[in-house]
Interface confidence: low
């Protein structure tokens, strides 16, 4: 009679992960008498996963009745299959023996691999903001992944992006991946309202994508465009100037005025208008009582923006020859009106 | 734009194999699943199975498993799949098809490759 | 696998009258996601399938709005709302939601 063979018929079997996996073995012989095992991995450090003869395996369960007579087939299926599950199982047939049994026979092993969904991306952008025309980088990460197969797309505004770097690790044989992308956007003026999304596809997302968005706008400063002008005359001794702080974003800044170079009021913008790209505008007014100088003022818009260096605009407010004239009999009670609407 | 070129048709002999084509253009060829696709004479479509480009990992389904072999050359950005102890029941035309990273699978496919099996 | 039953297999129709293809499948195709994998393709004769709609009842671009797909579960149904000549082919329902991905036997669509 011909020697006992043992029978794996599946190289490999995929299975996604909370699946059970059938892992199939079957003898061509009754003889020699003795239980079956199975294992996964080879040699001397290799998990026992099933022994017919004795034990508690709570999460397998037989395929067919073992103790029916003449039974041949010993596939075993593993129940709410984990990355961890992964490997090559064999199974192992023994001879009966005393005191104990002796390994006979082992089939050519099953590898089990598992199809395991990617976590949600996470988009981080970076710890300090950057102006228009500089570039940034945006990070994308994703754990837990199998097999190791996975598609990382990069788009801004719906437009896919071409300049980034993607490693998927560890680079060998693993229950389970990670995948870590870095991509470098080069921002725009327009850039509060823009979205960087990392869209990830695996074969056990079914075609429907994951993705992790960051927005720019934490990512972004615009620095402000200053405008100082002069509008007409409310009364004739009092001019009244304004700032027009133009296109910034973020919110955060502090305007001070400067007459010939003292410290006439600083304010901090509150009531903002919000521009279509995001980006604000905010005005101040500097009344400025002009019997109270007898010479030119230069008045300075000197504006602070999101803890930056600040930046200034000068304009210099002529005093007319008559004001001049009488502007020894002024006194000073009112060079500074508080700034109001026009 | 995408294009999936297979040629028109192969003419086998019983018994015989056949390694059919499908050269990729117009996007990164190692980053989406192949999926080839059976059409019998006068039948409808049958998925054979799909292969990744960049690990060259492939599954095909239990119909296939002993009938098609699935490989790639990322070099010439082609896939290929060997159909081997061809009979007359073999005689279709194939298809290869493309997967997309979002909704976009079974968009993208080739012309397909007449193979007819016959002494 | 999944079993996608098409009916009728041949549709019959007079160009600008409605048509409807019924498509059922063996089990759920409902996504543990909430979304449902289902296709529609054409064939034109000669040709290769086309992807007509997907996830049930998105059309593809450049899809006339004379198609639309509904459906859920196991029950799926496109509708041509007026026949045109360019229309008829071999139309196939198949489903991503389980692994191997299963076609329908198609259903041929002729001009009266």
């Known amino acids: 009679e011909d020697e006992l063979q043992v029978i794996q018929p599946e190289k490999s079997v995929s299975v996604a992960a909370g699946e059970s996996a059938t892992l199939r073995c079957a003898m061509t012989s009754l003889i020699p008498v003795g239980p079956i095992m199975w294992f996964r991995g080879a040699g001397a450090g290799r998990e026992l996963i099933y022994n017919q003869k004795e034990g508690h395996f709570p999460r397998v369960t037989t395929v067919s009745e073992l103790t029916k007579r003449n039974n041949l087939d010993f596939s075993i299926s593993i129940s709410n299959i984990t990355p961890a599950d992964a490997g090559t199982y064999y199974c192992v047939k023994f001879r009966k023996g005393s005191p104990d049994d002796v390994e006979f026979k082992s089939g050519a092993g099953t590898e089990l691999s598992v199809r395991a969904k990617p976590s949600a991306p996470v988009v981080s952008g970076p710890a300090v903001r950057a102006t228009p025309e500089h570039t940034v980088s945006f990070t994308c990460e994703s754990h837990g992944f199998s097999p190791r197969d996975i598609t990382l797309k990069w788009f801004k505004n719906g437009n896919e992006l071409s300049d980034f770097q993607t490693n998927v690790d560890p680079a060998g044989d693993s229950v389970s991946y990670s995948i870590h992308s870095t991509a470098r956007v080069v921002l725009t003026r327009g850039d509060v309202h823009s979205q960087v999304i990392c869209e990830i596809a695996h074969i056990t997302l079914q075609g429907d994508p994951l993705r992790g968005t960051a927005n720019l706008s934490e990512a972004i400063r615009v620095p402000p465009t200053l405008e100082v002008t002069q509008q007409p005359m409310r009364a004739e001794n009092q001019a009244n100037v304004t700032c027009q702080v133009s296109n910034f974003y973020p919110r955060g800044l502090q305007l001070t005025w400067l007459e010939n170079g003292n410290v006439s009021r600083t304010e901090t913008a509150s009531t903002l208008i919000e521009n279509k790209d995001g980006t604000y505008n905010w005005m101040s007014w500097l009344l400025v009582n002009t019997c109270a100088h007898r010479d030119d003022v230069v008045l300075t818009c000197q504006v602070e923006h999101d803890g930056q260096q600040a930046v200034s605009k000068s304009y210099a407010l002529e005093i007319s020859a008559h004001q001049k004239e009488h502007g020894s009999d002024i006194t000073h009670e009112a060079a500074l009106a508080p700034t109001a609407p026009l | 734009q995408v294009q999936l070129q297979q040629p028109r048709a192969e003419l086998v002999k019983p018994g015989a194999s056949v390694m059919l084509s499908c050269k990729a253009s117009?996007?990164?060829?190692?980053?989406?699943?192949i999926h080839w696709v059976r059409q019998g004479p006068g039948q409808g479509l049958e998925w054979i199975g799909l292969?990744?480009?960049?690990?060259?990992?492939?599954d095909c389904s239990e119909t296939f498993k002993n009938k098609a072999t699935l490989t790639v050359d990322t070099s010439s950005s082609t896939a290929y799949m060997q159909l081997s102890s061809l009979a007359s029941e073999d005689s279709a035309v194939y298809y290869c098809a493309r997967d997309g990273a979002s909704y976009d699978w079974f968009v993208h496919w080739g012309q397909g490759t007449l193979v007819t099996v016959s002494a | 696998d999944v079993v996608m039953t098409q009916t009728p297999l041949t549709l019959s129709v007079t160009i600008g009258q409605p048509a409807s293809i019924s498509c059922k499948s063996s089990?759920?195709?409902?996504?543990?996601?909430?979304?449902?994998?289902l296709n529609w393709l054409l064939q034109r004769p000669g040709q290769s399938p086309k992807r007509l709609i997907y996830?049930?009842?998105k059309l593809d671009s450049g899809v006339p709005d004379r198609f639309t797909g509904s459906g859920s579960g196991t029950d799926f149904t496109l509708k041509i709302s007026r026949v045109e000549a360019e229309d008829l082919g071999v139309y196939y329902c198949?489903?991503?939601?389980?692994?191997?991905?299963?076609f329908g036997g198609g259903t041929k669509l002729e001009i009266k």
């Open positions: 996830l049930v009842s």
């Open positions: 198949v489903q991503g939601t389980h692994f191997p991905r299963t």
């Open positions: 117009g996007y990164t060829f190692s980053s989406y699943w």
């Open positions: 292969i990744h480009p960049n690990s060259g990992n492939t």
């Open positions: 089990q759920s195709l409902l996504y543990t996601n909430g979304k449902t994998y």
